[in-house]
Each structure stands twice: as structure tokens, then as C-alpha cells.
Interface confidence: low
């Protein structure tokens, strides 16, 4: 049923009225306003921005706007004792030092409080030793080094290039390999697109540009000192030694000019293959240590950053629902940035601001959504998704009972090629239907729908004539809502052409050069892509909050469950002998998926023809839809990852950014051939199949007729 059938809606106040109110010019103006100074989490500047947003959301017409503060562990460089890396000679003299800051972009030379590049939460330390180049520091890179090349990283400082996987996974892998320090750098192969100039003349990374970022392995814990509970006034805090997810070895990021100086002297083993070579004019030797004449020189890190409990502020705005005020649809994105935040996060925050303004305009004209909409400006996302996680921990009982959906709103763009959507399968049909109603902003698709340009440029690998929609992983503020609480979630942004631009993220990500001008000059001068993203995010929120029957299709979950079961079975079948020896069977899982498919199909039939005028029956059916995502939550969580509780999806154990399906089974099977005790390892596979099969069956039963 269409949105404008909802109670208290005049024909004027339908989805079209909401979308028509969204203006590209406003998004541009808001982006400019949010990017003139740094808004680092825990700083006075970011507190002032929180209060400004609170004030403006009130003016826009929300019913209430509150600040929610928490005292969480953050990390900052020491202002009087800068971090850097040296090459030292045999006498211990520093013969080369990396730069202490990025050269500021034009027009920003006099801006104060630009935090120098650092790896947030690095411990202090001054390790020195031989260098080992570890490619991207992925699990498979260390397998290559240790198993194939017999290179031991123990006691070495490793240098890894950014890209492919979350930096925290790189650090964890280096720690497990015994390294005593990690240097992260941006290689032009990953952060310099051919044929494009460096900033300020283009959107590429200059040699002095550096990617900041946290290096935690929180696995969904939130504040490292208060896992599972909000970091409020009466919180019990762990000691720093017991804190969750902190790295144990010093880590520091550098740009490719400085990396060149370290890598050009590398000796030892040659790179194993071309996939280990970047684009610098260096041999990409693995090491350990420097070559020939330089063999007595070592690398020394000087890291003096400190971890400090600091106050952060979320802004939470409420637009009360007219019919179901106890059902929450949440739109949230973060406000804190590493420096100016031109793309991350303010291109997203500006879109949220305009969405709030449009909803507020409708509300001032007498309209209300059917369900309550919550708007959130999260703090400290860059330090480990802390603001969103602490708020969700504080409100978990309300959220698990009342949370309908969460739509994430970080960076609106990471390119200007086509749409990118990651979401729960429950939202596939919502996204498809919405994008068919929106105009494409793409050149060559004038007068065509967004669905058409998106499908053409990013086709689904499985279903012809449909666009690609990816699994949710992590690395953003939806994590606690989806992976921990089981609230249906989605995210949308404009992205690059992954076929032709194989660099990781966008080149200026988390650097000082991520400015308003970067967006206005090079990515989206007309702000038409921002407007399209506002329409997608806002349109999803509108439908979720306003449609009489929730716009979730449980049959799409059935389809992906079968696909994921097939995939994990095929992985297991790489070990047919062991499956036979240890009596490993996937029958229970396939049976549960079959049952889910049948029950979902029957539920969908009932959904077509029940009496929507009966509020009790309507609420009952909607609750079955709302709680379906919740049914995939295992209260015990995944092994060693208690805050990742979704049985169907979790962030990959090897890359936080990526989603993995049936993660419990996947992790149990991973590298199983090298396990010392195969009986125990295959026993764990069987246990994980059991958990997955039970969960799918239990979820199916929530869709059965209630009596």
C-alpha cells in the first residue's frame, strides 16, 4: 500500500511532498557550514557544533532535541612530543625522520587544532628494529610470509600499505605475527587514480597526505572501558589493561613520500608476486631489514600519544508518530571528523540536516508520520563507533522492543559514478521500489529512473535486470543496531566505478585535504548526487515510518539464506574426507532454510489479504515483520565476539568493513586444515551448523500463524 494511505495524511503530505522539499542548494550550504573548522571528537569545537545542530533541529520543527553525553576513552597525540619514525644508523643517530604534519591545503594555513596524522589508540613506545614489508597486512599476506616464504616477523617492525581491509585488522594480524611496531602508509597504487591531479588541483592524494584512523579491534564493544554498558556518570570502568580491543604495539601512519624513503632501502626477499608491488619506484622487497650498504641501519618509531577518558555528545531529535509513537525509525550519522570532514562525515551530516528540515516543514503544516522518527548526530564514530554504541547500550531495552529500522547516514559520496546500497534483505524491495520512483542524476540517463542507471552501472551478480545490493559489514554506526540488537538496517551513498578505480575508498580519505572545496570542485559541483542520496535515505525513512504495513519482504531473506547455505556448504566440501570422518552434515541447515522459505511464502500470502482496518491484526503482522530481524540474534553472540550476535551476518573476522554470511560456520571452517586438533575443530564446525540451523528454524517460526 502506498504511504499516503497512512492515518492523518492529506494528499499533499505524501512522499512526493517530502522529496520535493529537499534542495541541493541547502545541502551545499549546510556542508560549507559544517566544514570550516575541524570537529574532532572530544573537542570544544565539536561540542559547539552539537549545540548548533540541536538548536537548528528545534527550529526545523522537531518535537524535542536532546544532547546525550558519555565519557569514553579517546586517543590524542601529545602536543609537545610529536610522533614520528626515523631511520637510525649504527650509532643510533637519526638520519631520516618522517614529517610531523601534512602541509595544509590552500586557504587553511592559519586554521588551528588540525590534529597531526596518528593512529588512534596506539600505545606509547619507541621500538627499533628491522623492517618487514607485509603488503596489505591481510591474513593471507601473513600466511604467504610465514608459511610460504618462511619469514618471521617476530621482533620486527612491519610496514603495510593501507587498503583492502580495515586498518585494525592489519594491526591485529601484525601483533599475532609477533611484530613490535606497525607503520601504515598510502601507496599510490591504492590512493592515486591514474590521470587525475593531486589536491588542490584534483582529487588525488599528494605525497605528504596521510590517512588517520583508529586501530582498535573492538568487535562491537563500544567504549573500550565499559563494554556492554553505557559510559555514563556512574559507570564502572575497566582499567586500561583490561580495556577491550586496544592494540599492544605502537602504530603510526605516513604518506607515500615518507614511505618511499623507508621502502627504497629494503633488502631480503623479493616480493612473492606482482600483487605485492605498489606504484612507488622501489623494489618492494619484503626484508627483513635494509639491503647491502644500509644493512646496519634500523627503523625507530617514536610514539607518545595518550588515551584519555573524554566527554562526547550525541544529538538526538524526535518527531513523534501519530499512530504508533512506540515504534521507532532511526536516521543516524556521525558529526565528528578527523579534520575538516569534507566527505567523511559532513557530506552525510548535511544530508541528514536537510532531511530533518523537510520533515520539519511537513510537521509545521500539520502532518505527522505514522511511527516515531528519531534523528541522531553521533559523536566519536571515528574512535570506534562510540557515540552510537553507547546510546544504543543505554537505550537497548527500548530499541529491542520498539526499533523498526535504522538508516545510516555517514558520507553521502565516495565517488560520483553510481548508487551503492548495503542493507538487510528485508529492505531489498523497499530500495528497488523507491529507486524506480526517483530520477537518475547520472549523465546519459536524463529522464531515466535511478533504478535504471544503478542497475546498468552496478548489476547484481546473481539476478539479471537488478542492481547489486551488498551485505552489511561494519565500520560505521549501524553496527550496534544491526549486529548487536538485530534491528533491520540499511545504508546508501554514491560511489565510484569499482571496475576502473581499484583504489581503496577515496584517495583523500581521513586526510587534511578532505575539505568543502574537494566536494564542491571535484566530486559534486551541482550537489545533485548529494540530493539523490538525500532522496534515497529520506525516502526510505519516510516509507518505513509511514506505510501502513511495514515495507519488509521476508521472502527476500529466504532467497539469500539459501544462497548463503549453498556458499558455506561448498566451502566445507573442500574437505570431503574430514566431513565424512567427523560426520559433518548440513542437512539441518538446509532443512531449516527450506522451512523458512515455505513459512515466509505463506506469511506473504497472509500479508496480502488480512484486514488492515483491524488495528490489532495490523499491529500483529507488523510486529512479526519488525521482530524477524531480531529473531536472527543469538543472545550468546559469536565465539569470542559477544557483541556480534547476528547469526546470518557479521563483520568478517579478517576485515571489519566486509560482511560475512553464516559467520560462525565460516570462522570455524577458516584455515581448518592447519588446526592442531582436527577433531575439536570439526566439532566446532558441527556446533556452528547446529546454532545456524536452530536460529533459521526459530526465525521461521516467528512468521508462522500465531494461533
Amino acid at each position: 500500500k502506498s504511504s499516503n494511505e497512512a492515518t492523518n495524511i492529506t494528499p499533499k503530505h505524501n512522499m512526493k511532498a517530502f522529496l520535493d522539499e529537499l534542495k541541493a542548494e541547502n545541502i551545499k550550504k549546510f556542508l560549507y557550514n559544517f566544514t570550516q573548522i575541524p570537529h574532532l571528537a572530544g573537542t570544544e569545537q565539536n561540542f559547539q557544533l552539537a549545540k548548533q545542530i540541536q538548536s537548528q533541529w528545534k527550529e526545523f520543527g522537531l518535537d524535542s532535541v536532546e544532547l546525550a553525553h558519555y565519557d569514553v576513552l579517546l586517543s590524542y597525540p601529545n602536543k609537545t612530543h610529536p610522533n614520528y619514525i626515523s631511520i637510525i644508523n649504527e650509532d643510533g643517530n637519526e638520519i631520516f625522520n618522517t614529517s610531523l604534519f601534512e602541509p595544509p591545503p590552500p586557504g587553511y594555513e592559519n586554521v588551528s587544532d588540525i590534529v597531526p596524522p596518528f593512529s588512534a589508540f596506539s600505545p606509547q613506545g619507541m621500538p627499533e628494529g628491522d623492517l618487514v614489508y607485509v603488503n596489505y597486512a591481510r591474513t593471507e599476506d601473513f600466511f604467504k610470509l610465514e608459511r610460504d616464504m618462511k619469514i618471521n616477523c617476530s621482533g620486527k617492525i612491519v610496514i603495510a600499505r593501507y587498503g583492502k581491509v580495515f586498518r585494525g585488522n592489519k594491526v591485529k594480524n601484525a601483533q599475532l605475527a609477533g611484530a613490535k611496531g606497525v607503520i601504515l602508509y598510502s601507496d599510490p597504487a591504492d590512493y592515486f587514480a591514474p590521470g587525475v591531479k593531486s589536491y588542490p588541483d584534483g582529487w588525488n592524494l599528494p605525497g605528504g597526505g596521510v590517512q588517520r584512523g583508529n586501530i582498535l579491534n573492538l568487535n562491537g564493544a563500544g567504549d573500550p572501558l565499559t563494554p556492554g554498558y553505557p559510559a555514563n556518570e556512574y559507570a564502572y570502568r575497566r582499567g586500561i589493561a583490561e580495556a577491550v580491543g586496544l592494540p599492544s604495539i605502537p602504530v603510526h601512519p605516513i604518506g607515500y613520500y615518507d614511505a618511499q624513503k623507508l621502502l627504497e632501502k629494503m633488502g631480503g626477499s623479493a616480493p612473492p608476486d606482482s600483487s605485492w608491488r605498489g606504484s612507488l619506484k622501489v623494489p618492494y622487497n619484503v626484508g627483513p631489514g635494509f639491503t647491502g650498504n644500509f644493512s646496519t641501519q634500523k627503523v625507530k618509531m617514536h610514539i607518545h600519544s595518550t588515551n584519555e577518558v573524554t566527554r562526547i555528545y550525541n544529538v538526538i531529535g524526535t518527531l513523534r508518530g501519530a499512530v504508533e509513537p512506540d515504534r521507532y525509525v532511526i536516521l543516524g550519522g556521525h558529526r565528528d571528523s578527523w579534520v575538516f570532514g569534507g566527505i567523511d562525515p559532513q557530506s552525510g551530516a548535511a544530508v541528514v540536516h536537510e532531511i530533518v528540515r523537510s520533515f520539519g516543514t511537513l510537521k509545521k503544516e500539520g502532518w505527522r508520520p505514522r511511527r516515531t522518527i528519531l534523528f541522531a548526530s553521533w559523536d566519536a564514530e571515528e574512535f570506534g563507533l562510540l557515540g552510537s554504541t553507547e546510546w544504543a547500550e543505554e537505550n537497548s531495552r527500548l530499541l529491542q522492543e520498539r526499533g523498526v529500522a535504522y538508516i545510516n547516514a555517514d558520507s553521502s559520496i565516495e565517488g560520483n559514478y553510481t548508487l551503492r546500497v548495503d542493507c538487510t534483505p528485508l529492505m531489498y524491495s523497499l530500495v528497488h521500489n523507491l529507486t524506480k520512483e526517483l530520477k537518475s542524476p547520472d549523465e546519459g540517463f536524463e529522464g531515466k529512473s535511478l533504478y535504471e542507471s544503478w542497475t546498468k552501472k552496478s548489476p547484481s551478480p546473481e539476478f539479471s535486470g537488478m542492481p547489486r545490493i551488498s551485505k552489511l559489514g561494519s565500520g560505521n554506526d549501524f553496527e550496534v543496531f544491526f549486529q548487536r540488537l538485530g534491528i533491520a538496517s540499511g545504508r546508501a551513498r554514491y560511489t565510484k566505478n569499482w571496475e576502473t578505480n581499484k583504489f581503496s575508498g577515496y584517495p583523500l580519505y581521513h586526510s587534511v585535504y578532505e575539505t568543502y572545496e574537494l566536494v564542491e570542485k571535484f566530486y559534486d559541483p551541482m550537489f545533485k548526487y548529494h540530493l539523490t542520496v538525500a532522496q534515497v535515505r529520506g525516502g526510505m525513512v519516510f516509507e518505513l515510518a509511514n506505510s501502513i504495513v511495514l515495507p519488509f519482504d521476508c521472502r527476500d531473506y529466504a532467497v539469500v539464506l539459501r544462497k548463503y547455505a549453498d556458499k558455506i556448504y561448498s566451502i566445507s566440501m573442500k574437505h570431503p574426507q574430514e566431513m565424512k570422518t567427523y560426520s559433518v552434515s548440513f542437512d539441518s541447515l538446509f532443512s531449516a532454510v527450506k522451512n523458512f522459505t515455505e513459512i515466509a511464502s505463506k506469511f506473504s500470502e497472509r500479508l496480502q489479504d488480512f484486514d488492515k482496518s483491524n488495528p490489532i491484526v495490523l499491529r500483529m503482522m507488523n510486529d512479526q515483520l519488525m521482530f524477524l530481524e531480531r529473531a536472527f540474534i543469538d543472545p550468546l553472540g559469536l565465539p569470542d565476539r559477544p557483541f556480534y550476535r547476528h547469526v546470518i551476518y557479521a563483520p568478517s573476522s579478517h576485515n571489519k568493513y566486509a560482511g560475512e554470511s553464516f559467520p560462525g560456520i565460516y570462522d570455524a571452517l577458516f584455515d581448518i586444515e592447519s588446526k592442531v586438533d582436527p577433531s575439536k575443530a570439526w566439532g566446532e564446525v558441527k556446533r556452528q551448523i547446529y546454532v545456524a540451523a536452530f536460529t533459521v528454524q526459530a526465525a521461521a517460526e516467528t512468521l508462522s500463524e500465531v494461533a
Epitope: 579491534n217 575497566r238 556446533r687
Partner: antibody, heavy 120, light 107 residues
């Protein structure tokens, strides 16, 4: 049935070191936290240290922090306690314990204990 | 640190008696409390976990109750094999502290 078998106890001089081991058999320990608890002669129980299932996180009583290190080797199903700078007040029977992940019970299974005597 | 105070420190009872041991925490520990039984020269044995859940193989005459700061272990009908020392322990916040013990002796 889960069985825990401690070893490595004995007589050691003050300032010396010992490494205790605890071998687990029966059931899966993949997802279980493990612990050391000690009991001085004629006294009550005192928690010493805890380690997470993957070994990523460890926790210590203030009385042993900086001197003792808990670790585990999941491939060998073995828990360890490295005890350095031993003092007379560390004299005790040391028990290793394991949680029961399936039921959520902490300190569900206990070993029979190994005696550590610190004396000159 | 959270202090756990057991009472009484010792008690004398006869076979068939109903015995109650209490344990008080110095701050709220929700339901994160275990009870153990220890016989001389033996390792402690888990009786009750998470305040009221009977551990595997423990007879049903043992029961636990409470929440927050005040907890009780009850033996509904004391048996000869129940004469031992009983400990409570909180595992809400590290350090995971034990009570000082309650010795149940034959009257």
C-alpha cells in the same frame, strides 16, 4: 565430561618463577573463558586471573598484576600461568577453572589443584 | 573492589535440617553470583550459577535466590554428604571476589 589437570607446582624460593599448566579434556573449550583461583593453606578462595576464549583479553587480581601472566594455547587445549617474582604470600593451592559456554555458567569446571610453596 | 560477606561463618545442623546461608555484596551485582561447595582436601565444586541455576549433577535440594546485593543458598533437607564449606562468588565486575566461606558442621 570436562576434566582439568593442573601441573607445574612445587617449591620455589622467594623471587623465583614457576609456570603452571592446566590441560583440558572432554567438551569444547573453544568459546570458554578460563581462570586461575588460589587457596592459601587453611584460608578461603582468591581469584587470580581470567583469560578470554580467544586469549585476546586477560584480567588479573591486584595482588598479582605485573608479576603473573595468564595465557592459553587453544590448539593444545592448555591454560598457563607464568608466575614471576614469587613471594611467600603466593603460597597456595592453585586451581584452574573453565566456564561452560553452553549454559553460560562461569567457573563451572575446576581442576584438582597444584600446590605452590614459596619458601627459603 | 566488591566485598562479599557470608553469614554465618559456621553453623551446626543435623541431617534433615533446612539450612540457609546468606551472602551480601557491597554493591549491586545483578544476578552474577555463584555458590560452591568444598570438602577438605578437594577442589571446590560449582553448585549454583547465576544466582539460581542448578549446575549439572547437583541435587535439587540445593537452591539459590536473590538479586542485587542479597543472596541466599538453601539446602532444603541436609544430607550427610552436604557437610562442607560453602562459598559465594560474584563475577559481575573484576576482581571476581569470593565470600569468606560458611562451614556446615554436624551438630
Amino acid at each position: 565430561e570436562v576434566q582439568l589437570l593442573e601441573s607445574g607446582g612445587g617449591l620455589v624460593q622467594p623471587g623465583g618463577s614457576l609456570r603452571l599448566s592446566c590441560a583440558a579434556s572432554g567438551g569444547y573449550s573453544f568459546s570458554d573463558y578460563m581462570h586461575w583461583v588460589r587457596q592459601a593453606p587453611g584460608k578461603g578462595l582468591e581469584w587470580v586471573a581470567t583469560i578470554s576464549s580467544g586469549g585476546s583479553y586477560s584480567y588479573y587480581a591486584d595482588s598479582v598484576k605485573g608479576r603473573f601472566t595468564i595465557s592459553r594455547d587453544n590448539s593444545k587445549n592448555t591454560l598457563y600461568l607464568q608466575m614471576n617474582s614469587l613471594r611467600a604470600e603466593d603460597t597456595a593451592v592453585y586451581y584452574c577453572e573453565k566456564d561452560n559456554y553452553a549454559t553460560g555458567a562461569w567457573f563451572a569446571y575446576w581442576g584438582q589443584g597444584t600446590l605452590v610453596t614459596v619458601s627459603s | 573492589d566488591i566485598q562479599m560477606t557470608q553469614s554465618p561463618s559456621s553453623l551446626s545442623a543435623s541431617v534433615g535440617d533446612r539450612v540457609t546461608i546468606t551472602c551480601r555484596a557491597s554493591q549491586d551485582i545483578r544476578n552474577y553470583l555463584n555458590w560452591y561447595q568444598q570438602k577438605p582436601g578437594k577442589a571446590p565444586k560449582l553448585l549454583i550459577y547465576y544466582t539460581s541455576n542448578l549446575a549439572s549433577g547437583v541435587p535439587s535440594r540445593f537452591s539459590g535466590s536473590g538479586s542485587g546485593t542479597d543472596f541466599t543458598l538453601t539446602i532444603s533437607s541436609l544430607q550427610p554428604e552436604d557437610f562442607a564449606t560453602y562459598y559465594c562468588q560474584q563475577y559481575w565486575i573484576g576482581p571476581f571476589t569470593f565470600g569468606q566461606g560458611t562451614k556446615v558442621e554436624i551438630k
